[in-house]
């Protein structure tokens, strides 16, 4: 069917169309273009003959339009008369007649528009604003922008005169905005530069900073005051109702307790004639004096006495703050303040109460700490620790033993063997010892002030003959790639050389494997789970040697990913599919599968007789392990063919 | 459903020995590892031991070691609990118990229990 | 071998009370802990396993917690069904252990 296409079909004036024609019939005679929805011999724009490809105008011609030997029509530099129909009429070689109508419509570039406005500078919550888009224009649309965003959905904001006039009631300093208005047709759109609506408003309640009301005597005084206004306020100060200045900032230096009072700050506004106020009051304090603390016993004895340590001076209306080492009071049933704080009470004094102790006395304004004082707390003799630590000597060496005691006074020390007293002295020395030095070696401490004593017992063997060693550890389960783990060969013996075995062999040499403490001490940093040996200590002298029995080091790891077998994944309808996971891992990781994501058994073989096509999916195997707090998974897909075809083919 | 299944009370005298069977259903018998436990008059709950029906391993706690035998047969998914040597202090309800999973998992189906008394 | 310890041996609580049952652990086991209930003449239930997951089908009123050594079954709100013997077990290698079990009852 012969039809035509206006492009475009929305023209701009002074620019151009093309009638285009589609489904033109075979064996023409020729054509011709007429202005109209028919054929018209007035109206006949241009005619065209086929066999000589002579183009005659009609009366419509203007001399704007192209005719073409495939009969498309060409209108250049369009002008607004040209909206409307036009009506293609086809002469077949045989006479029999065509007709096909088109259309376009034409439309003006428009102007750049502007924004008038009925009111420049409008007071907040009071006047309404109307903005207008000029020019008016027919067939035009026109739309509005806030800060370059379509217009906020408000009662306040009022579109009329066919979208062309904005109102805005009751402004507010919020719509202190950018607006433009666009106007658009189906050939062009503009948009206007922006207008900023000025909006006159204020001033706040003002704010009076800094916001502290104490001050003491002597400091300078800086008051700030601000309201929010526009345009800026103009402020002036009043002291207990009396004008002092007309600024922002009131400064007085040096106050005294004369300068307290109540300080107003008034803010104008002059366009929008308004007045706000704010009253700050004031207190200038005097210096108070400087406290101290006294003490009802000067030396208390650990867990007897209790110390009362009180705040002077004594004033009245006072707030006493109390300090333990720069820190607040701690909460404990051990410490009481009285009713007015100014005494604290130690009960049941501990070494650890020494202090230092402050107190404070509090006004409005700030807090004058005492100097420190700290307490002397009688303790002690503890259990005293005997030095070095070795239990075996071998004959021949020197015995030189030491005593200490956490003492305050420092204690008194005195040495039995077997019972019997040696000596009062915080060493023993013994040269040359010989297995009748074996024995039981007593210190004992003493502390004169509060009269206790304590004693500590080594059982000290003088032997050649080493004893069996054993291997101490500090971590029995260590996680592999996070943990270490520090072996000990005990006992500590004087003399001695240690050494180590490593799965019956000697150590290896790793960055991972450190000795210390004169080879006492095996460090394994990062532990893996190849670190799962035998480990033994050996202990040697000169005149004997020794080997500990072994220690397994249980390394906590994985689970590794796991591995799902087979490895098929195309099975026949029919078959059974046995789905075995593991992943290496200690303690053995608890299994559990999920079938395309929803979970079924926790065990480490799935089974599925039988299984058809209904089976094909997701079969996930997770792995999880406790003790290391680790996780793993892995995903295999599993396609089931119907019986008799081969995977991945189908009949 | 899954169901475990104890064969019925047994009395025995002192010296003699007990086995007591456990048939197994609604679940595939071979992929979860079966436990046995017991539970003495007015007392707690003691682990005897399990077995892996798919392989026939079996873990016996150091307790019952050498006086318990635990089997299975997987074409009656069954399983079984020889105690020998009885004693008086043998005396108790053995529950055999299903594996929530394989390693490290509790137990999630249990047995009705078979009473073993054991008198002279 | 692992001893598991339970505490208290018994409690007796009003309908609607908050119940806590502990277990210690003489070392660590990790997350590896199962809790059980045993009414008066029937078989032990499975409640809870890896310290804090609940069994499907039971009530959200019981709830565990805890790791390493020490662990809690709490019942938010007791009901006259929860009267029963509860036991804590350790699922981390053999030999399995259980806890000595904790009675409870309503007032």
């Known amino acids: 069917k012969l039809t035509i296409e206006s492009t475009p079909f929305n023209v701009a004036e002074g620019k151009e169309v093309l009638l285009l024609v589609h489904n033109l019939p075979q064996h023409l005679f020729g054509y011709s273009w007429y202005k109209g929805e028919r054929v018209d011999g007035n109206r006949q724009i241009i005619g065209y003959v086929i066999g000589t490809q002579q183009a005659t105008p009609g009366p419509a011609y203007s001399g704007r339009e192209i005719i073409y030997p495939n009969a498309s029509l060409l209108i250049q530099n369009i002008i607004q008369n040209d909206t409307g129909f036009y009506t293609l009429h086809v002469i077949k070689s045989d006479l029999v007649n065509e007709e096909a109508t088109g259309q376009f419509r034409v439309y003006p570039e428009l102007p750049k528009p502007s924004i008038s406005s009925n009111n420049s500078k409008p007071v907040e919550d009071k006047d309404a604003v109307a903005f207008t888009c000029e020019p008016e224009t027919q067939d035009a649309t026109y739309l509005w922008w806030v800060n370059n965003q379509s217009l906020p959905v408000s009662p306040r904001l009022q579109l009329s005169n066919g979208n062309r006039t904005l109102t805005l009631f009751n402004v507010t300093r919020n719509d202190t905005a950018s607006y433009k208005c666009e106007t658009q047709n189906p050939v062009s759109a503009r948009r206007s530069d922006s207008v900023i609506l000025n909006v006159l408003y204020g001033p706040d309640a003002p704010t009076i900073s800094p916001l502290n009301t104490s001050y003491r005597s002597g400091e300078n005084l800086n008051l700030s005051c601000h309201a929010a206004s526009n345009p800026p306020a103009q402020y002036s100060w009043f002291v207990n109702g009396t004008f002092q200045q007309s600024t922002q900032e009131l400064f007085i230096p040096n106050i005294t307790v004369n300068n307290s009072g109540s300080y107003t700050c008034q803010a104008h506004n002059s366009d929008t004639g308004l007045n706000r106020t704010t009253v700050t009051t004031i207190t200038v304090y005097a210096e108070p004096p400087k406290p101290f603390i006294t003490s009802n016993n000067s030396n208390p004895v650990e867990d007897e006495d209790a110390v009362a340590l009180t705040c002077e001076p004594e004033i009245q209306n006072t707030t006493y703050l109390w300090w333990v080492n720069n820190q607040s009071l701690p909460v404990s049933p051990r410490l009481q303040l009285s009713n007015d704080n100014r005494t604290l009470t130690l009960l049941s004094v501990t070494r650890n109460d020494v202090g230092p102790y402050e107190c404070g006395i509090q006004n409005e304004l700030s807090v004058d700490h005492s100097d420190p004082v700290i307490l002397n707390v009688l303790y002690g003799p503890d259990d005293p620790t005997i030095s070095p630590s070795y239990t075996y000597y071998r004959p021949g060496v020197n015995l030189s033993l030491s005593c200490h005691a956490a003492s305050n006074p420092p204690a008194q020390y005195s040495w039995l063997i077997d019972g019997n007293i040696q000596q009062h002295t915080q060493e023993l020395f013994i040269s040359n010892i010989t297995e009748k030095n074996s024995g039981l070696y007593t210190c004992q401490a003493n502390n004169s002030a509060s009269g206790h004593s304590r004693t500590t017992v080594k059982t000290i063997t003088v032997s050649a003959e080493l004893p069996k060693p054993s291997i101490s550890s500090n971590n029995s389960k260590p996680v592999e790639d996070k943990d270490a783990v520090a072996f000990t060969c005990e006992p500590e013996a004087q003399n001695t050389t240690y050494l180590w075995w490593v799965n019956g062999q000697s150590l290896p040499v790793s960055p991972r494997l450190q000795l210390s403490n004169g080879n006492r001490t095996l460090t394994l940093f990062n532990v893996t789970r190849n670190d799962a040996r035998a480990y033994v200590c050996g202990i040697q002298n000169s005149v004997s040697a020794n080997r500990s029995d072994p220690v397994t080091l249980d390394v906590l790891y994985g689970p590794d990913t796991p591995i799902i077998s087979p490895p098929d994944s195309s099975y026949l309808s029919g078959a059974n599919l046995n789905l075995s996971c593991h992943s290496a891992s200690n303690p053995s990781p608890q299994y559990s599968w999920r079938i395309n994501g929803i979970p079924q058994q926790h065990t480490q073989v799935l089974f599925i007789a039988k299984i058809t096509p209904n089976n094909n999916g997701t079969y996930a195997c997770f792995v999880s392990n406790l003790a290391t707090g680790r996780n793993n998974s892995i995903v295999k897909s599993i396609t089931v063919s119907a019986s008799g075809t081969s995977p991945g083919l189908s009949a | 459903q899954v169901q475990l299944v104890q064969s019925g009370a047994e009395v025995k005298k002192p010296g003699a020995s007990v086995k007591v069977s456990c048939k197994a259903s609604?679940?595939?018998?071979?992929?979860?590892?079966l436990h046995w436990v017991r539970q003495a008059p007015g007392q707690g709950l003691e682990w005897i031991g399990y077995?892996?029906?798919?392989?026939?391993?079996?873990n016996y706690s150091q307790k019952f070691q050498g006086r318990v035998t635990m089997t299975r047969d997987t074409s009656t998914s069954t399983a079984y609990m020889e105690l020998s040597s009885l004693r008086s202090e043998d005396t108790a309800v053995y529950y055999c118990?299903?594996?929530?999973?394989?390693?490290?998992?509790?137990?999630?189906?249990w047995g009705q229990g078979t009473l073993v008394t054991v008198s002279s | 071998d692992i001893q598991m310890t339970q505490s208290p041996s018994s409690l007796s609580a009003s309908v609607g009370d908050r119940v806590t049952i502990t277990c210690r652990a003489s070392?660590?086991?990790?997350?590896?802990l199962a809790w059980y209930q045993q009414k008066p003449g029937k078989v032990p239930k499975l409640l809870i396993y890896?310290?804090?997951n609940l069994v499907e089908g039971v009530p959200s009123r019981f709830s565990g917690s805890g790791s390493g050594t020490d662990f809690t079954l709490t019942i938010s709100s007791l009901q006259p069904e929860d009267v029963a013997t509860y036991y804590c077990?350790?699922?981390?290698?053999?030999?399995?252990?259980f806890g000595q079990g904790t009675k409870v009852e309503i007032k």
């Open positions: 118990a299903r594996e929530y999973g394989n390693y490290n998992y509790p137990l999630d189906y």
């Open positions: 077990q350790h699922h981390y290698g053999t030999p399995y252990t």
């Open positions: 609604g679940y595939i018998f071979t992929s979860y590892w």
């Open positions: 070392e660590n086991i990790y997350g590896y």
């Open positions: 890896n310290a804090k």
């Open positions: 077995i892996n029906p798919n392989t026939g391993y079996t």
